[in-house]
Structure formats: structure tokens, C-alpha cells
Interface confidence: medium
């Protein structure tokens, strides 16, 4: 069995691809024959799914290299650190070469035990085709966000709530230590493996897999709001505003604003992901009578999505309508 | 497999009380509207009420406000439909139903529960 | 309370033939309009929600249109196993209204 695949590369060149690069294997034990690479889509971290970005100036900073998301509060000024004795916002200190050496020992010696314990050989499945990755994105994305059709099956459970396990997929690649793997989901964290195999393959397996981690980019377009902008009255001089999710968002969509007026649109309410995923749209309350305007805007994981056409609504001085909703 | 399951048949008598169960399964029970529909024998469908089992938000159709209480365990993934006291007319199959993949109550059910047979009479 | 009118009540068909259900409500709902299928002794089945939009693993020949107060359901092609009561549900207000219900049989 050959020793794992080396200096595992992946960058993004697209929203929907990653390209992979390595090295051989130092130790090929034969002729190196193709290797195998499996790719899974990592779940979001579940703080986003519970935080309320409506409730607290909070946004989330977006770091490509490593497909981490932390969040900061806006509010506070940044952490100011102790650099050479000096007070004040700097860069951290520069890594001395054995620092530098430590810590990528650390980092090969992390990967090659995670190895150790995911898959110590790897046996490649004969025959596999690799499948379209859509038909799992499709049947793994929220199932609120269709609007044509309904899921495929009832045996999903909706990845918003979970933190879900998602499918790894494969394909072999010969004679190359490069490839690009494509129709992935925009700005969202995936798994790359790389297994070595050789000659012996098919008797003995391949290699255990060397990973790595790499976001796609964002797609232009990708957190607009789909279809129109519905509206219907409520009692008390309120009403409902009904949108449709983005299908397929840069990661998540994490709240929506709505910028709405009478004569400009100067008034702003936030919906958070929680009541848009009970309710589908949001309430307006305490409209004086008239004719308004409204606008929506999606914010996701990798910034905000253009603003609706405008929905023009009106209302009246009195409604007698049935209860309604919230 | 996302699936509801409804409790099993019940015989009554006029003026006890009964909660009828549907437990929810393969879904996240909590972020989903649940409603319960009624169907007299050899009748339509009536739709009696829903629950948004996260915070217990419930609406009721005007003509069974007042006479059923829709209520739901997030713990045991459970919705629940109970009568105070039940009537000879209140004999009817019960379904619970919810709008899973459909996502919101206002594009319809989805999913549904077997049914639970009430028989309420003297 | 809007109300929701289904009709015919019931028709005789043929296989094969085309079938037209209508549902008018009394007030506009916008598209939040649901169409089921009924089988003697079985639960309701979702055909069509937001008006046209088909369910998962319902056959094409169901279809829906139609947006503010008039719906309609059709089968473009009836099989022997869409003898069955279809009712229409309307869904934007505090509460929901199913229609009287269709009783497709068999002509």
C-alpha cells in the first residue's frame, strides 16, 4: 500500500469548483497507478443556525483560507494584543523558525493520527461512478427554499436544525496530482481526501487519505431573493410581507431587512432566520393608512444580496378582516 | 423516514375527556407547523387547528375554538389534541398532518398521520 | 370568514378523460391554495400546494392553476386510480378552510 498523498493543495476559482493539487506519495511501494478523490460538504457551525443577528449587533467574519466563520461584535473596538513590549492594535509577533517547524510537525502529526483513526487503508469501491453532486445538494438543501418543486423524498431532515453528516463523493484520478472538482454549493466548506493507490489496489486498497479544507466563493447573485414579494392585509393597520428564500444562498442566510415608507423608505425592520423560517415573510405593524413601498434584503454567511423590486401596498383606515396571522 | 403516528381508536362516553397523541419522527419536530383535521362519517375535511410546537403558537378555526385544546411536547417530539368534555357529534376520524417539506402551513400538509378513530356515544 | 366554494360536488368520468375541479373563494388569497386526493378508508394525499406547484412524486397529469379567487385543478388524463374525493384547502389567515370536497366516479 502506498504512503499517503503529500502537500494537499485546495483553492477556489469559482463558486461551484475547488481545485485540488499534491505530491506523490513518498513512499509509492510499486507503481503508482491513479488516486482517489473524495470531497464531502462540511455542515455549518450550529451557533449560526441559533444566534439571532437581529437581536445584537453581530456579524460574522468571513476567513476563506481556513472555511472558519467567527463572530464579532460590532460594537467593540478590536482586541488590542502585547507585541514587543509595545501596547496597542498590531499584528501578532513574527514565528521563529523552530515555531514555524513546531507547529507544522504538530499540524502533519494531527492529520496523519486523524488518518490513522478515520481509515487506515482505504479500499476503493469497484466500479463506482462518481455521481452528480446536485442530486444530493438538491435533496440536503432546506426544503423551504423550493419553489417549483418539493423534495424528492420524505426521508430527509431538514440540515438547518441538524448538523448533519453529509455524503462524501469520489472520482479516481490517473496519471496527475491535480484536479478540479465542480458543481459545489457557493461559499460553503468542504472535506478534499486524496488516497494513493498502486498496482496492488484492488487486493490490498489504497492509501489512508491526506486531507485538506477549502471554501468555494461566493456566487454573484447567490443571496437574491427569488420571485416576487407578496403582501396581504392584517387587522389594526398592520400587514404581512411573504418572500421566497434564495434556492441555493452563499452558506446560509442569516436574517433579512426590509426597508419600507410611505413616501420614501426610510423605516427598517430586521427579520431574523428564526421567525422568517416559522412564519415565511414577517409582519408590519403600526402603519398609518396610505400607500407604502417595501424593499428586502438578504444577508448571508458571505454578505447581502441585491434589494427586492419594491412591493407597493396600502392601508386602509379601518379593516375588518378575520383574525390573521401573528 | 419522516413519519406522524397517531395514538389508537378510542370509545367514549358523552362528558369524559380525551387527549389523542401523534408523534413526529425523522424531522425536527420543533420547526414545523402541526395541525389536526376532523372528518365526520362519510364527510369532508374539517380543519380544526395548528401548532408551531417551538413556542407553542397555536390557532384555532373559529369553529372549534373553545371546544378542543391543541397543545405539544418538543421533549417527546408529541402534539396532542384534548377534549374537556366530549360530545356524541364529536365522533369522527382525527388526523394530524404537518407541512414538512412543503416548509410553511399556508402552502398545505405533507404529511400525515394514520388517522384516530373517536367514538363517543352512550 | 372567506369561504370556499368547491364545485361540481361530484362528476362521472371516463379514463382518459380530461377533469376539471374549481374552487372559488370568497375573498382574495393570493396563491396559498392546496388541492388533496381522498381514497375511501385513507388519509388525504397533498397533490398541489401554492396553488400549482405539483408535490413530490405526483404524476404530471395533476396539475393546478389559477391566483387570487379562482383555482382549478386538472387531470389531463384520468387513470383507473384517480377515482377518488379531491378537496381544495385555502391557507392565509389565522385559520384554514377546506372545500366541500369532489367525488370523481366512475362513469
Known amino acids: 500500500v502506498p504512503s499517503i498523498p503529500l502537500d494537499v493543495l485546495s483553492a477556489s476559482n469559482s463558486s461551484s469548483q475547488l481545485i485540488v493539487k499534491w505530491n506523490p506519495p513518498s513512499l509509492p511501494n510499486g507503481n503508482l497507478s491513479y488516486y482517489i478523490v473524495r470531497w464531502q460538504r462540511q455542515p455549518q457551525d450550529g451557533y449560526l443556525y441559533r444566534h439571532n443577528y437581529c437581536s445584537k449587533d453581530k456579524i460574522p467574519i468571513r476567513k476563506y483560507a481556513d472555511g472558519t466563520i467567527d463572530i464579532e461584535e460590532v460594537t467593540e473596538n478590536p482586541k488590542t494584543e502585547v507585541c514587543g513590549g509595545e501596547k496597542g492594535p498590531c499584528c501578532a509577533c513574527p514565528k521563529t523558525e523552530a515555531e514555524k517547524q513546531a507547529e507544522k510537525e504538530e499540524a502533519e502529526y494531527r492529520k496523519v493520527f486523524e488518518n490513522f483513526l478515520h481509515n487506515s487503508i482505504f479500499v476503493p469501491r469497484p466500479e463506482r461512478k462518481r455521481r452528480d453532486v446536485m442530486q444530493v445538494a438538491n435533496t440536503t438543501m432546506s426544503s423551504r427554499s423550493r419553489n417549483t418543486t418539493a423534495a424528492d423524498t420524505y426521508n430527509i431532515t431538514d440540515p438547518e436544525e441538524l448538523e448533519t453528516e453529509y455524503p462524501f463523493f469520489e472520482s479516481r484520478v490517473d496519471n496527475k496530482e491535480r484536479t478540479v472538482i465542480s458543481n459545489l454549493r457557493p461559499f460553503t466548506l468542504y472535506r478534499i481526501d486524496i488516497h494513493s493507490c498502486n498496482h496492488e489496489a484492488e487486493k490490498l486498497g489504497c492509501s489512508a487519505s491526506n486531507f485538506v479544507f477549502a471554501r468555494t466563493m461566493p456566487a454573484e447573485g447567490a443571496d437574491d431573493i427569488p420571485g416576487p414579494v407578496t403582501w396581504e392585509p392584517r387587522p389594526e393597520n398592520s400587514i404581512f410581507l411573504k418572500w421566497p428564500e434564495p434556492e441555493n444562498p452563499n452558506g446560509l442566510i442569516l436574517m433579512y431587512e426590509i426597508k419600507y415608507g410611505s413616501q420614501v423608505e426610510d423605516q427598517r425592520e430586521c427579520v431574523s432566520r428564526q421567525e422568517y423560517r416559522k412564519y415565511g415573510g414577517a409582519k408590519l405593524n403600526r402603519l398609518n393608512p396610505g400607500n407604502y413601498t417595501a424593499r428586502i434584503q438578504a444577508t448571508s454567511l458571505s454578505g447581502n444580496g441585491s434589494w427586492t423590486d419594491p412591493v407597493f401596498f396600502y392601508v386602509q383606515a379601518k379593516t375588518g378582516y378575520e383574525n390573521f396571522i401573528h | 423516514q419522516v413519519q406522524l403516528v397517531e395514538s389508537g381508536a378510542e370509545v367514549k362516553k358523552p362528558g369524559e375527556s380525551l387527549k389523542i397523541s401523534c408523534k413526529g419522527s425523522g424531522y425536527s419536530f420543533s420547526n414545523y407547523w402541526i395541525g389536526w383535521v376532523r372528518q365526520m362519517p362519510g364527510k369532508g375535511l374539517e380543519w380544526m387547528g395548528i401548532i408551531y410546537p417551538d413556542d407553542s403558537d397555536t390557532r384555532y378555526s373559529p369553529s372549534f375554538q373553545g371546544q378542543v385544546t391543541i397543545s405539544a411536547d418538543r421533549s417527546i417530539t408529541t402534539a396532542y389534541l384534548q377534549w374537556s368534555s366530549l360530545k356524541a357529534s364529536d365522533t369522527a376520524m382525527y388526523y394530524c398532518a404537518a407541512s414538512i417539506v412543503t416548509g410553511y402551513y399556508y402552502y398545505g400538509l405533507d404529511v400525515w398521520g394514520q388517522g384516530t378513530t373517536v367514538t363517543v356515544s352512550s | 370568514a372567506i369561504q370556499l366554494t368547491q364545485s361540481p360536488s361530484s362528476l362521472s368520468a371516463s379514463v382518459g378523460d380530461r377533469v376539471t375541479i374549481t374552487c372559488r373563494a370568497s375573498?382574495?388569497?393570493?396563491?396559498?391554495v392546496a388541492w388533496y386526493q381522498q381514497k375511501p378508508d385513507k388519509g388525504p394525499k397533498l397533490l398541489i400546494f401554492?396553488?400549482?406547484t405539483l408535490q413530490s412524486g405526483v404524476p404530471s397529469r395533476f396539475s393546478g392553476s389559477g391566483s387570487g379567487t379562482d383555482f382549478t385543478l386538472t387531470i389531463s388524463s384520468l387513470q383507473p386510480e384517480d377515482f377518488a374525493t379531491y378537496y381544495c384547502q385555502k391557507y392565509n389567515s389565522d385559520y384554514s378552510t377546506f372545500g366541500g370536497g369532489t367525488k370523481v366516479e366512475i362513469k
Open positions: 401554492a396553488a400549482s
Open positions: 375573498q382574495d388569497i393570493s396563491n396559498y
